[in-house]
Structure formats: C-alpha cells, structure tokens
C-alpha cells in the first residue's frame, strides 16, 4: 500500500511550479469517471505538491488517482513523466481481507464508494469507533489490525488508522463498514448523503 | 435506458444444477452491484446476496451460503446466478436487480429484471 | 436477521378510500425503509426509499412514515391500478429482509 501515493508525489514533485499550475487547471476540467467528484476549485489552487497528492488520493483513491494524474500528464504533453508513474504504480497488490471471498483478477476499475467519498467526514465525525471495530473484527479486520486501530488515542485518529486499511478492501469489505455506520451512526450518513 | 434482462424458465431436475443470467444495458456492469432474489408462489420475496462485478466481490445471505454462487461476465455485460443441488423448495421465481443510484449511503432497488421461473421436478 | 412483520396480510377497500399498511422491524433500522408494489404476475416497483421519500415517476397518492422500528404506507384516494402486494423492505443491515406483504384489493 502507498507506492501510487509516492509516485504520484514523484510525479508532482519533479512539475515546475509554471507545470503545477497548469496541472492543477487541466484537473479541473479533466472527464471524471461516473461517480467521482472534482476538487474544489479554492482549495486546488493554492495546494503545493504534497497537499495535492494527499487530495487526489483521498479524493480518487490511489488507483485511480495515479490514472487520473497519468492522464493530466499526457494530455500536457509530459509522456514520459506519465509513463513512469503508471510503470511505478503497476507493481503487486495485497493479498484480499479476511473472511470475504476474493475477488477474481478483473481489469474493471470500481467506482468510488459512499466511504470513499465521505471519507475525511468520517474522520472527523465519527465517535463509536470501537462499536465499528466489533462489527468488523473477523470479517473484514484481521486481529493485528483490530489492535492498532484501537491503541490509537483519538477517535479522529483511530479512524484515519481505519481508513488506512480500506485501499485494499473490497466493495463488500467497505459495504460492511457502511453497514456498521448506518447501524450505529444513522444521522451522520443521512448527513453525508445530504451534503 | 437501464434493462436488465434475464433468461428464460428452466425445468429441471432434483440433484441438477443451473445457471440464471441477467444481462444488462444502459449502463457499465462494473458501475453498480447486481443483487439476486427469489419469490416462491404466494410466497415474500428473499434477498440472495449480490456481487460487485467491478471487482468481482460477493455478498451472500447465510441461508443461500453454498446454494446460489453469483458471478459475472463483463465482455458480454451478464452476471449470472449458479444454483447447486436443486429440490422443490428451489422451484420459484428468481430477479436480478440493481440499486437506483451509485455510491448511495443504502441500497434501494430501482431497476429490476423481468424474472425467470425455475421448476425443480421429477 | 432482522424480522420485518407486515400488516394486515390482506386488505380489501373502496375506491376513493384512504388505507394505511403497517410495517414493524424486530430491531432499530432508522430509516433505511424501501417499499415496493408488485402487482400480480408483475416485477416489484419500487415506491418509497429512505422511509419517506418518493421514488421518480411514483403517483403522489403514495407516501411512507415512520423511523425506528415502526413504518406506515398510505394510498390516499384509491384507485384501480393500485391493486396488487405491497412489500417493506429493510436496507440497513445484511441479510436485507422483507416483510411478508399485504395483498390489497378493491370492493
């Protein structure tokens, strides 16, 4: 996990900043696939290399985030940068979570998921994390992981310990911390939906 | 627009198996989930299970578990539902579906197929 | 597996008549509540989503209640086409489960 995250950062860090710039344009009006959204405008502009990789991230997932970056770089005229990057992300994955059947290799590309999507608000917002940790020890959590996520000192903190497991959840895996959440935390995603 | 269109009835025999299509069209097979249920005569409906043919993923209901086994041919835009060990108590109706919208906080089933009609008999 | 108990199991009412079926989760499901109308030898049509709201193209004389463990449809003014089985369903949690429906008829 995290080597599209760092080639990404290699990709954005080796831009001229006359290049970041243009980048961060072309990002706003590059075709998104059906059910990602776009960057603020506001918050995209004034990003430096860093901020950006941790937004497109968040915003995209690293698969696709280092896609949609590949892309930006092509159409900028920066083919070899955006070679490298896809070389670089295009290595081994991990092996599938516990107790939910693995998927067979599939050249599809999933869209992003509402915890995905929501995923810095859940962050944020949300308290019971230990009630969300029951739910899915065993079935989607694996016990050293169940472990670190609970030694973490705050809520906030505790679920961006989560949410560094989920990259290599798949959509039932996240379909069950969903459920989780509707369960125990109905009026945040109600909220969420809403926002 | 969205259709999903599913195979025609089978009549089978006890101890036989069989596979169920749902081929859909107006939208990407890997965009949204395909759930299953089933509807005896006069009976509810039951929910199956799904699978996420995006990454190929499933879901099932314990009471399906080692029943129904849901897969999905992307090339031709069918998910399928292999049913095993067939008695009478398989004999139903079965729907493919697929929620209303993506990325949604639940699933609501907003589209669903015309149904196939599965006879287990002697 | 949460139980969802619906009633009554059959109904039989006049045109123009207002009715109301009820629907009761053996457990909290908030309000991850579907109801859907399926009318005979017919695919289910979804009717209201999240409770309460009403899914696109559905005639306004639908409308659904409730949050928790208690939910109600109502169809104000009754018509014809209305015939059929209604089913609630809950989306909250895994097995998703229905109720047993309530078939209703016209007098």
């Known amino acids: 996990m995290g080597r599209a995250r760092d080639a990404i950062l290699d990709a954005l860090e080796n831009l001229t900043a006359e290049e970041l710039k243009k980048f961060k344009l072309k990002l706003l009006s590059v075709p998104l696939r059906e059910g990602y959204g776009r960057i603020p405008r506001g918050a995209l502009l004034s990003m430096d290399a860093l901020d950006l990789t941790d937004k497109l991230v968040s915003f995209y997932l690293e698969t696709y985030g280092a896609e949609l970056t590949a892309n930006v770089l092509r159409d900028m005229g920066l083919q070899e940068m955006a070679g490298q990057l896809q070389a670089a992300t295009h290595q081994g994955s991990g092996a599938a979570p516990a107790g939910i059947q693995a998927p067979p290799q599939s050249a599809a590309k999933p869209g992003l998921h509402f915890i995905d999507q929501h995923r810095a608000a859940l962050i944020a917002r949300v308290t019971n994390v230990e009630w969300l940790l029951d739910a899915l020890y065993g079935k989607v959590l694996t016990d050293e992981q169940y472990q670190a996520v609970r030694a973490e000192p705050t809520n906030p903190s505790k679920m961006r310990k989560l949410f560094s497991f989920t990259p290599a959840w798949n959509w039932t895996c996240k379909d069950l911390l969903l459920q989780a959440l509707r369960e125990s935390q109905s009026y945040l995603v109600e909220d969420l939906e809403r926002s | 627009q969205v259709q999903l269109q599913q195979s025609d009835a089978e009549l089978v025999k006890p101890g036989a198996s069989v596979k169920i299509s749902c081929k859909v069209s107006g939208y990407a097979l890997t965009d949204h989930s395909i759930h299953w249920m089933k509807q005896r005569p006069e009976q509810g409906l039951a929910w199956i299970g799904y699978?996420?043919?995006?990454?190929?993923?499933?879901n099932y209901n314990d009471k399906f578990r080692g029943k129904a086994t849901l897969t999905a041919d992307i090339s031709s835009s069918t998910a399928y539902m292999h049913l095993n060990s067939l008695t009478s108590e398989d004999s139903a109706v079965y729907f493919c579906?697929?929620?209303?919208?993506?990325?949604?906080?639940?699933?609501?089933?907003?589209?669903w197929g015309q149904g196939t009609t599965l006879t287990v008999s002697s | 597996d949460i139980q969802m108990n619906q009633s009554p199991s059959s109904l039989s009412a006049s045109l123009g008549d207002t009715i109301t079926i009820t629907c009761h989760a053996s457990?909290?499901?908030?309000?991850?509540l579907n109801w859907y109308q399926q009318k005979p030898g017919n695919i289910p049509k979804l009717l209201i989503y999240?409770?309460?709201k009403l899914h696109t193209g559905v005639s306004s004389s639908f409308s659904g209640s409730g949050s928790g463990t208690g939910f109600t449809l109502t169809i104000s003014s009754l018509q014809p086409e209305d015939i059929g089985t209604y089913y609630c369903q809950q989306g909250q949690s895994y097995p998703y489960t229905f109720g047993g429906g309530t078939k209703l008829e016209i007098k």
């Open positions: 999240k409770a309460s």
């Open positions: 457990q909290n499901i908030n309000v991850w």
């Open positions: 579906t697929r929620p209303y919208s993506f990325g949604s906080s639940y699933d609501y089933f907003g589209y």
């Open positions: 699978m996420y043919p995006g990454d190929g993923s499933a």
